[in-house]
């Protein structure tokens, strides 16, 4: 699986999970969250070369396809396949509201 | 939505999904596949900024980041959506055989 | 450009044997089922018998009437399919076809053998 | 088996005449929308040629006149406008199931 535990103990220039602090405050300009300052939220990136983690008929297909037509601009793409949420907390007025995003962090890739 | 109806009436060089006719025996070597000859598989690209057509909390983030850190490799990616089968005739032996093949046109794409 | 080149016909009495080949080119031979298609003399065409590539286990087909005397058989290093005919009889006096099959048509044909069965 | 009778077993027509030719199989030949049958054109001396192949896909090199079509156990080629090289017989022929078998014959002769 292209999950953390494997892409971020590896070298590995096709399809992989990378990692991806974000700032909060910094990054986003969102003030309002107060904890935490920022996270690990994580990106998918790399080539998907031919039945790499394909997600589906299609994207088998295309990368076939993209093997035997490499001029063409027609590829599988590296995208999240886990996510898991994050809890924050911020402030309505003077209250606390702790919420859980959900999404937010990316586990593992798969080519689409 | 970013699908066949939008995208193959506009001049969109956002996330849109393209016309990509394959065939089966030319441009994947499938010889067994005896009907149809080809078929419209589709394929989506094009920049992916900020909310367009988010999958998730994740490429909403990742489309602000990208925004705001116009110089970082992380930015959400426009792959398939919807999906539709096709119905393909081969042969096993001299035996006829239909089948349908599942998510082999792209009809929609989005960010992720 | 796909071609099929039947040999071995000829004039043989009944009981005899004979042994078609049918040498192919142009194609992926090692991929298709081959077949042997005759007509007789005043008659219409008739599938004697078929075997299909080696994904499919060279599965053969033999008609009612040649059952259990002709063989067919097929050496894909040589691109060639043969027919052994043995015991045979007048009714198998025919024009032998060669011919492939790459998706449920006969799409190439040989030019035909004569195969003449006589006393 | 599948058996396929063709109707009529032989016709005269003249150059410039619209020709049909049937063939009814005893079973369905059909599978999904794929129609398995297909037709051949058959000289004397020569070997058969495909013509029609899947019921109405016209094969590579044969002129647009011929045309064919049916579904199920009823299919049909048709010749819009007859030409001298037009006389023949022809042949229908299902790969619906193993044995594929082909139909009795139409011979096509000048009027």
């Known amino acids: 699986a292209l999950d953390t535990n494997y892409c971020f103990r590896n070298l590995e220039e096709n399809c992989c999970v990378r990692p991806l602090y974000i700032d909060f405050r910094q990054d986003l300009g969102w003030k309002w969250v107060h904890e935490p300052k920022g996270y690990y939220a994580n990106f998918c990136s790399g080539p998907c070369p031919y039945l790499r983690s394909a997600d589906t008929t299609h994207s088998t297909v295309l990368g076939l396809y993209n093997t035997l037509n490499p001029e063409a601009s027609a590829s599988p793409c590296c995208v999240p396949q886990d996510l898991e949420p994050l809890t924050i907390l911020y402030y309505v007025g003077r209250t606390p509201k702790v919420e859980q995003l959900s999404n937010m962090v990316v586990k593992s890739c798969k080519c689409s | 939505a970013l699908d066949t109806n939008y995208c193959f009436r506009n001049l969109e060089e956002n996330c849109c999904v393209r016309p990509l006719y394959i065939d089966f025996r030319q441009d994947l070597g499938w010889k067994w596949v005896h009907e149809p000859k080809g078929y419209y598989a589709n394929f989506c690209s094009g920049p992916c900024p900020y909310l367009r057509s988010a999958d998730t909390t994740h490429s909403t983030v990742l489309g602000l980041y990208n925004t705001l850190n116009p110089e970082a490799s992380a930015s959400p990616c426009c792959v398939p959506q919807d999906l539709e089968p096709l119905t393909i005739l081969y042969y096993v032996g001299r035996t006829p055989k239909v089948e349908q093949l599942s998510n082999m046109v792209v009809k929609s794409c989005k960010c992720s | 450009e796909v071609q099929l080149l039947e040999s071995g016909g000829g004039l043989v009495q009944p009981g005899g044997s004979l042994r078609l080949s049918c040498a192919a080119s142009?194609?992926?031979?090692?991929?298709?089922?081959m077949s042997w298609v005759r007509q007789a003399p005043g008659k219409g065409l008739e599938l004697v018998s078929d075997?299909?590539?080696?994904?499919?286990?060279?599965?053969?087909y033999y008609s009612d009437s040649v059952k259990d005397r002709f063989t067919i058989s097929r050496d894909d290093s040589k691109s060639t399919v043969y027919l052994q005919m043995n015991s045979l009889r007048a009714e198998d006096t025919a024009v032998y076809y060669c011919t492939v099959a790459p998706g449920g048509s006969f799409d190439y044909w040989g030019q035909g053998t004569l195969v003449t069965v006589s006393s | 088996d599948i058996q396929l009778t063709q109707s009529p077993s032989s016709l005269s027509a003249s150059v410039g005449d619209r020709v049909t030719i049937t063939c009814r199989a005893s079973?369905?030949?059909?599978?999904?929308?794929?129609?398995?049958m297909h037709w051949y054109q058959h000289k004397p001396g020569k070997q058969p040629k495909l013509l029609i192949y899947r019921a109405s896909n016209l094969a590579s090199g044969i002129p647009s006149r011929f045309s064919g079509s049916g579904s199920g156990t009823d299919f049909t080629l048709t010749i819009s406008s007859l030409q001298p090289e037009d006389f023949a017989t022809y042949y229908c022929?299902?790969?619906?199931?193993?044995?594929?078998?082909f139909g009795g014959g139409t011979k096509v002769e000048i009027k």
């Open positions: 022929q299902h790969s619906r199931e193993s044995p594929w078998t």
């Open positions: 075997i299909v590539s080696k994904t499919y286990n060279y599965t053969t």
């Open positions: 142009g194609f992926d031979f090692n991929s298709y089922g």
């Open positions: 079973q369905s030949v059909s599978i999904s929308r794929f129609n398995l």
